[in-house]
């Protein structure tokens, strides 16, 4: 199926930028892995690079405004021609759900006191209003609540006195059109405008004051332009060469508004001064290699020794990583493929342990299923031996940091009948549904 092809993918927003054009295949668009595509206008934007997870979205608002609720966030597998970690296809959403609490308590309504006395009328002649008030304290609301209805009410009042009305001008009317629209005519062009004493008219009984000043004014028309000449397009110029050596590019033709040039405020030529076409080199663009994440550390060993576990003998271990995705003469990955460090092996060593404090509450699982729960733990944490934190392995090479490696066997006193982990679980409340914000299709 044809797609819309773009020259840029904006990682921060997940949007396609720089429309190249439509009607091309995904394979042609993605000859350049810096490009991106959309299956339809306004649809999901997918970059042409190999798939990886987007950044996590911000947490959605809490599902309730008071007491405990839940909130979701998501990230999307974006890219082309492959899968993200977890072996999922591009377009897939991964969700996280956590408990939240915007406000501990929920608002409670209050009640009104009785109405106070009426205040005096707001005017001394004709009709006005008077007001009375009441207090929201019977009882007072709690936790940011309020009382239903209004704290004051008003009613009409009549002083039985007639007020005089003074005249005031309505706004000026528009200027009448000038007698000519461009300069050089037989009569000097003039324009006039008028206004009425009607906003309001002065009263008769009791008598109001008339409007001050004149009801009309006149002026000479100035700055009339010479009569305008509309612009016209010249012919299209030659097609520019394809500006790229790989993937898709854009060629351009230009024309000039000079047949004739617009004069004296005449309109510029309608339409575009440039038009573009997609050009296809049919050559794939270079793809730089990207490091995979580091592999696991190898066991901590010392040459010519069977085992150094549970002993104050430093060893060495290494880990590696793979440069993936390099194609079509792209750059190799920068940096080292192997990482080496010094270590003490505590693999399967019986060590004295102590119980940790409670961990923070974990995420709610499953985020997209029924009855999600969250958990926290206390762990039997090993007390590490007091071995030297640095060693000098080779003369003249200075001190090297030494890291503990391996899974020891910590021993703690029993806690709630457990020797290694004590876990507490709680249900997550007011759980929202996992719904694709793009909602690709309903």
């Amino acid at each position: 199926d044809p797609v819309l092809c773009f020259t840029q993918y904006e990682e921060s927003s997940g949007k396609c930028k720089g429309l190249l054009g439509g009607g091309v295949s995904v394979e042609d668009c993605c000859l350049n892995t810096a490009f991106a595509y959309q299956k339809r206008s306004g649809g999901l934007c997918q970059p042409c690079r190999s798939p990886r997870w987007s950044l996590w979205s911000t947490w959605a608002p809490c599902s309730v405004t008071c007491s405990e609720g839940s909130q979701l966030r998501y990230r999307r597998c974006v890219g082309w021609n492959g899968q993200c970690s977890g072996k999922v296809a591009p377009g897939t959403l991964e969700w996280q759900l956590q408990a939240c609490e915007d406000q501990q308590c929920c608002p409670e309504m209050g009640g009104w006191s009785g109405w106070g006395p009426w205040e005096p009328c707001s005017v001394t002649c004709s009709k006005g209003t008077r007001t009375r008030r009441r207090a929201c304290n019977h009882p007072a609301p709690k936790c940011g609540g309020h009382c239903p209805g209004q704290a004051q009410e008003s009613e009409a009042c009549d002083t039985q006195q007639v007020c005089p009305t003074h005249g005031a001008w309505a706004t000026w009317g528009p200027w009448t059109p000038c007698s000519a629209s461009c300069h050089g005519g037989p009569h000097e062009p003039k324009e006039t405008r008028s206004r009425k004493c009607s906003a309001p008219e002065p009263s008769q009984k009791p008598p109001g004051k008339p409007c001050p000043g004149l009801a009309y004014e006149q002026r000479r028309c100035t700055g009339l332009p010479p009569c305008p000449v509309a612009g016209g397009w010249g012919p299209w110029g030659p097609v520019s060469p394809c500006p790229v050596t790989c993937g898709l590019g854009q060629t351009m033709e230009q024309r000039t508004c000079n047949h004739p040039v617009p004069q004296h405020g005449g309109p510029f030529c309608a339409g575009d001064a440039t038009r573009t076409h997609i050009c296809n080199t049919a050559v794939p663009c270079p793809v730089d290699g990207e490091w995979d994440s580091w592999g696991e550390w190898s066991p901590c060993i010392r040459r010519n020794m069977k085992s150094i576990s549970c002993q104050e003998i430093p060893g060495q271990q290494s880990r590696g990583r793979t440069c993936r995705g390099r194609k079509f003469d792209g750059h190799r990955c920068a940096g080292q493929q192997q990482d080496i460090r010094h270590c003490y092996s505590i693999q399967h060593c019986p060590l004295k342990g102590s119980w940790s404090e409670w961990s923070t509450w974990g995420l709610c699982m499953p985020p997209c299923g029924p009855n999600p729960t969250r958990a926290r733990q206390r762990l039997c944490t090993p007390l590490l031996p007091k071995y030297p934190p640095t060693v000098s392995m080779v003369e003249g090479q200075g001190e090297k940091n030494v890291t503990f490696w391996g899974r020891p066997l910590p021993r703690c006193e029993e806690l709630q009948g457990q020797k290694l982990v004590v876990e507490e679980k709680r249900p997550c409340l007011h759980v929202p549904a996992c719904k694709d914000p793009e909602e690709e299709e309903l």
Epitope: T92, D436, E440
Partner: nanobody
């Protein structure tokens, strides 16, 4: 363990309708995302329709959109595929699939057979012209 059993297939004329059912023994279907797939002889398995566990989103393949409808009856522990205006190219074995609640969602995810944990044995639909 969830066991899925499809029924409702058969031989029909082009333009006719069928209602396929997928019932379960064992656990309740209400907490699962459910999908229908089909496979014609000599062809790869193809996504047809899916619905999320709360039925907040429903997805269809372009080839069946507007003709097929996926729905469920939690009280009967059954998921349905209503197929209208059938065409000869709809001829295939139709399979029902269930996905344990997970942290993933989206059209791309539910279109992949690998996303589902349990499968039925299938029911044959044949459409003659």
């Amino acid at each position: 363990q969830v066991r899925l059993v499809e029924s409702g297939g058969g031989l029909v004329q082009a333009g006719d309708s069928l209602r396929l059912s997928c019932a379960t023994s064992g656990r309740t279907l209400s907490s699962y995302a459910m999908g229908w797939f089909r496979q014609a002889p000599g062809k790869e398995r193809e996504f047809v329709a899916a619905t999320t566990w709360r039925d907040t989103s429903t997805y269809y393949a372009d080839s069946v959109k507007g003709r097929f409808t996926i729905s469920r009856d939690n009280a009967k522990n059954t998921v349905y595929l209503q197929t209208n205006s059938l065409k000869p190219e709809d001829t295939a074995a139709y399979y029902c699939a269930a996905e344990e609640p997970s942290k993933y969602s989206g059209r791309s995810y539910y279109m992949m057979g690998a996303s589902y944990d349990y499968w039925g044995q299938g029911t044959q639909v044949t459409v003659s012209s």
